[in-house]
Interface confidence: medium
C-alpha cells in the first residue's frame, strides 16, 4: 500500500468525502488548503515558489507561519510565509525557525540553555502526557518546573522539528502535527511546485535526510508531470 | 491537570436536535485538534468528529455528516457538536476527547426515543 | 473504511498471567495505533500511543508491538486493576476506527 511505501510519512489524496463533504458546508475544509510540506525547507529546493494561502500555521511547512503578507493588511487574505531567523522581530512561537522561540518579540535560540532559564511562554507535553514535547500547537502558556529533558518520540504532538528526537520530523496529520520519520534514500518524497490549487491534503511527509534531495525517480522521467514520481535520492 | 467536562445530554424525540458542549481546562485548548466520540451501550467505540485547533477544519464520520456539526469556541475553551435531525441509532455516550483521544470526558447520554 | 479486527474478542485470566491482545487492520496503517482500557461506566484510557510508545503514568507492564497491519497489546503480568474492556484504534485515515474490543475477565 501507499503507507508501507511511505513509512509513516503517510500522504494521501483526500478522497472526496474529505476533500470535500467532510468539512460541513460552511466549514473552511476546501477553503482553507492544507500544504503538503514546505516551502523553506533546507533539504529541499521548490520551484516556482508561489505564495500560499493558509488559515493557520499548521497548514504551513515547518520553515513557514501563517500570515497576512503586508503589516496591518487584510487578516482574512493569509499566506505562507518563510520563518524569521534569530534576532529577527516576532509576535509567536510559530513565526520563528525551528530551533528559536518567540521571547519578548523577538525570536531567540531555544537551546537546552536557554530552554531552562528563559521560556516562560511554552507548556512542555508530549502527546498530553508529562514527558517533554511541545504540546499541540502552543503558542503562549506557562512552563511547570518540568524541564525540556527528552524530546517527541514518533508518533508524539510536537510544534516543529525541533520538538521531535533526532531523526523524526515534526508534520501535519489530520488536524494535529506529529513527530514522524524523516526520509531515507529510496523513500516517496513530496516536491511542492505550488501552482494552482491543491486539494485539502492533510498529511505531511517529511523531508529527506542530510546528504539526500528529492527528485524525480529516473524510470519516471517519462511520466507525464501530474503522476512523476519523486524520490530521496544522493546529491 | 487536563480536564474535559461533558454536558447538554438528555432525552430528545427521532428528528429532534440537541447541542452538546464539552469545557475544556488544563491546557492551552486553541493548540489542540479535539474530536468527539461514542458508545452506544453495551457497544464498542465509534469516531463521529474532529476539528483543528483553530476550528478551521472539521471532519466527520460517514453516519453523522451533513446531520451534526462540530465547532469550537477557543475564548471559552470549549468544544461544541451540534445534532439535527437525530436518530435511534444516534443513543449513546457522547465523549469529547483531545488530540487523537490523549485525553476523555466522562462522557454525556444523548437518547433518541418516542 | 478501514476495519479494526481484536482478538480474542473476551479471555479469562489469573492474576499474574502474561495476557496478549492482537489487533489486525485492514489495510497497512503503519504505526498510527492506539490502544485503550476501558472500565464499566467511565471513559476510556489510553494506554499506548504510536502502536508502540507508553501513555504517561501507565504501568510499565502493558506494551504494544506492531506496525502495519499486526499490532499487539501484553500485559506482562496482569494485576486485579487490569480486569477491562480493551480497544484498538487506528487514526491512519479518517473515519478514524476502533476494535471491537476484547474483554479481559478473571478466571
Known amino acids: 500500500t501507499l503507507n508501507s511505501v511511505l513509512n509513516s510519512n503517510a500522504i494521501k489524496n483526500l478522497p472526496p468525502p474529505l476533500g470535500g463533504a467532510a468539512g460541513h458546508p460552511g466549514s473552511a475544509v476546501s477553503a482553507a488548503p492544507g500544504i503538503l510540506y514546505p516551502g523553506g525547507n533546507k533539504y529541499q529546493t521548490i520551484d516556482n515558489y508561489q505564495p500560499y494561502p493558509c488559515a493557520e500555521d499548521e497548514e504551513c511547512g515547518t520553515d513557514e507561519y501563517c500570515a497576512s503578507p503586508t503589516r496591518g493588511g487584510d487578516a482574512g487574505v493569509q499566506i505562507c510565509l518563510a520563518c524569521r531567523k534569530r534576532r529577527k522581530r516576532c509576535m509567536r512561537h510559530a513565526m520563528c525557525c525551528p530551533g528559536n522561540y518567540c521571547k519578548n518579540g523577538i525570536c531567540v535560540s531555544s537551546d537546552q540553555n536557554n530552554f531552562r532559564g528563559e521560556i516562560e511562554e511554552t507548556i512542555t507535553e508530549s502527546f498530553g502526557n508529562d514527558h517533554s514535547t511541545l504540546d499541540g500547537y502552543s503558542r503562549r502558556t506557562t512552563l511547570s518546573s518540568k524541564m525540556y529533558h527528552s524530546k517527541g518520540q514518533e508518533g508524539s504532538v510536537c510544534l516543529r522539528s525541533s520538538d521531535c528526537a533526532t531523526g523524526l520530523c515534526c508534520a501535519r496529520h489530520f488536524w494535529s502535527k506529529i513527530c514522524k520519520p524523516v526520509l531515507k534514500e529510496g523513500q516517496v518524497c513530496t516536491k511542492h511546485r505550488r501552482k494552482g490549487s491543491h486539494g485539502l491534503e492533510i498529511f505531511q511527509r517529511c523531508y529527506c535526510g542530510e546528504g539526500l534531495s528529492c527528485r524525480i525517480q529516473k524510470d519516471h522521467h517519462q511520466a507525464s508531470n501530474s503522476s512523476r514520481l519523486h524520490t530521496c535520492q544522493r546529491h | 491537570q487536563v480536564q474535559l467536562v461533558e454536558s447538554g445530554g438528555g432525552l430528545v424525540q427521532p428528528g429532534g436536535s440537541l447541542r452538546l458542549s464539552c469545557a475544556a481546562s488544563?491546557?492551552?485548548?486553541?493548540?489542540?485538534?479535539m474530536s468527539w466520540v461514542r458508545q452506544a451501550p453495551g457497544k464498542g467505540l465509534e469516531w463521529v468528529s474532529g476539528i483543528s485547533g483553530s476550528g478551521s477544519y472539521t471532519y466527520y464520520a460517514d453516519s453523522v455528516k451533513g446531520r451534526f456539526t462540530i465547532s469550537r469556541d477557543n475564548s471559552k475553551n470549549t468544544l461544541y457538536l451540534q445534532m439535527n435531525s437525530l436518530r435511534a441509532e444516534d443513543t449513546a455516550v457522547y465523549y469529547c476527547?483531545?488530540?487523537?483521544?490523549?485525553?476523555w470526558g466522562q462522557g454525556t447520554l444523548v437518547t433518541v426515543s418516542s | 473504511d478501514i476495519q479494526m479486527t481484536q482478538s480474542p474478542s473476551s479471555l479469562s485470566a489469573s492474576v499474574g498471567d502474561r495476557v496478549t491482545i492482537t489487533c489486525r487492520a485492514s489495510q497497512d496503517i503503519s504505526n498510527y495505533l492506539h490502544w485503550y482500557q476501558q472500565k464499566p461506566g467511565k471513559a476510556p484510557k489510553l494506554l499506548i500511543y504510536g502502536a508502540s510508545n507508553l501513555q504517561s503514568g501507565v504501568p510499565s507492564r502493558f506494551s504494544g508491538s506492531g506496525s502495519g497491519t499486526d499490532f499487539t497489546l501484553t500485559i506482562s503480568s496482569l494485576q486485579p486493576e487490569d480486569f477491562a474492556v480493551y480497544y484498538c484504534?487506528?487514526?491512519?485515515?479518517?473515519?478514524?476506527?476502533f476494535g471491537q474490543g476484547t474483554k479481559v475477565e478473571i478466571k
Open positions: 484504534q487506528q487514526y491512519d485515515s479518517i473515519p478514524m476506527t
Open positions: 488544563g491546557f492551552t485548548f486553541s493548540s489542540y485538534g
Open positions: 476527547a483531545r488530540h487523537y483521544m490523549d485525553h
